[in-house]
């Protein structure tokens, strides 16, 4: 075995956003409106929800999750189109369960190649591999039935599961995926 048995470094370490503004922190601005918006989180490599105040802020703000992904996730549109057009299952769907070595307690889903189904497992929060999804729906769209959906729900196939628990993020961070106990 190598130092990190599934070589997550090569899969995750070189992620660069498409535009420099994608690296900006979420900025809710000084106003008091409560507008659900989305930003690209450099640390998780995911588009996430935040509450925008309605004025000022910065360019790392999108009205829809899809718009955020298209703008900031490298290769997102290509991958989404591929999954939607009945393309083959990504290789990482065949990786075996890897909970990592940290002490987080995160309910996640993986594709089980024996049962050909997405199943629940507990992820420790660090290392691990890309066969690791925050929702059952996401797992199914990517691994169980890659040609069966619109591709719109393909939630960051580049895998942002490196964090132990993302509660240290930007202000007004209401991203619902990370707070399972």
């Amino acid at each position: 075995l190598s130092e990190e048995a599934d070589d997550t470094d090569s899969e995750l370490g070189s992620m660069k956003p498409l535009h420099t503004f994608c690296a900006m922190k979420a900025d809710d601005g000084p106003c008091k409106a409560m507008i659900r918006s989305y930003f690209f989180n450099m640390y998780t490599h995911q588009c996430e929800e935040f509450i925008y105040g309605g004025c000022e802020g910065n360019e790392n703000r999108f009205d829809t999750l899809e718009e955020c992904k298209k703008t900031c996730i490298p290769g997102y549109e290509k991958t989404a189109v591929k999954a939607a057009s009945g393309a083959e299952r990504p290789d990482f769907c065949f990786l075996e369960e890897d909970p990592g070595l940290c002490r987080g307690y995160m309910k996640r889903y993986l594709y089980n190649n024996q049962t050909k189904q997405c199943e629940r497992f507990v992820y420790g929060g660090c290392l691990g591999n890309r066969n690791n999804f925050e929702t059952l729906d996401e797992c199914k769209k990517i691994c169980e039935n890659p040609g069966g959906g619109s591709g719109g729900g393909l939630n960051d196939i580049f895998e942002a599961q490196k964090i132990e628990w993302h509660e240290g993020g930007p202000p007004h961070h209401h991203h619902h995926h990370h707070h399972h106990h």
Partner: antibody
């Protein structure tokens, strides 16, 4: 009662190798990540390596990469640490630990002394 | 050289409240949990706080943890003589891809 007992420490010359073991009783380790932590004389705690329950995720501190190999045998309920090319600064008390979600189990440590 | 910095020592008299800081960065405390340990050299470290602010069963509620941004903090209220020990923070560092302990803080109970 859960017990972790380290063994394999001792006095060894620089350049030699040593294999530390950690035997666990009172808990089946299959599903748990395990760690090695050391404390050098007069220094603080230092995490050196960790391994997931199924051995698929393995991590090492930069300071030991290339010289340490962590492994486990779930059938024997044991954790191991192979230390190669021992150096004087590997002299330390080595603890094995299991970090659970809401608690920890630690051994009492095994002392490794490297000197010529 | 640890990437998590703690004050080398803090002291207080019995009954006082003392706090220990643990300063890190976005790649560790900023996006990860911080955990706290009490350690008497030569014995097994004891987990005091896990996941920022949770106490394991058996740990007195005099010990509390918090996190803000890239720093963690451990507070000991109602200081007692048996609290004399070394205290360490611990977090996973996503850049180093390793757990890192803080530099350690020696707590001394005066008088």
């Amino acid at each position: 009662e859960v017990q972790l007992v380290e063994s394999g420490g001792g006095s060894v010359q620089p350049g030699r190798s040593l294999r530390l073991s950690c035997a666990v009783s009172g808990l089946t380790i299959d599903n748990y990540a395990m760690q090695w932590v050391r404390q050098r004389p007069g220094k603080g705690l230092e995490w050196v390596s960790g391994i997931s329950g199924n051995s698929r995720s393995i991590g090492y501190a930069d300071s030991v990469k290339g010289r340490l190999t962590i492994s486990r045998d779930n059938a024997k309920n044991s954790l191991y640490l192979q230390i190669d090319s021992l150096r004087a600064d590997d002299t330390a008390l080595y603890y094995c630990a299991i970090f659970l979600h809401e608690s920890d189990y630690w051994g009492q440590g095994t002392l490794v002394t490297v000197s010529s | 050289q640890s990437v998590l910095t703690q004050p080398p020592s803090v002291s207080g008299t019995p009954g006082q409240r003392v706090t220990i800081s643990c300063s890190g960065s976005t790649s560790n405390i900023g996006t990860m949990y911080v955990h706290w340990y009490q350690h008497v050299p030569g014995t097994a470290p004891k987990l005091l706080i896990y996941r920022n602010n949770h106490r394991p069963s058996g740990v007195p509620d005099r010990f509390s943890g918090s996190k803000s941004g890239t720093s963690g903090s451990l507070a000991i209220s109602g200081l007692r003589s048996e609290d004399e020990a070394d205290y360490y923070c611990l977090a996973w560092d996503d850049t180093l891809r390793a757990y890192v302990f803080g530099t350690g803080t020696k707590v001394t109970v005066l008088g």
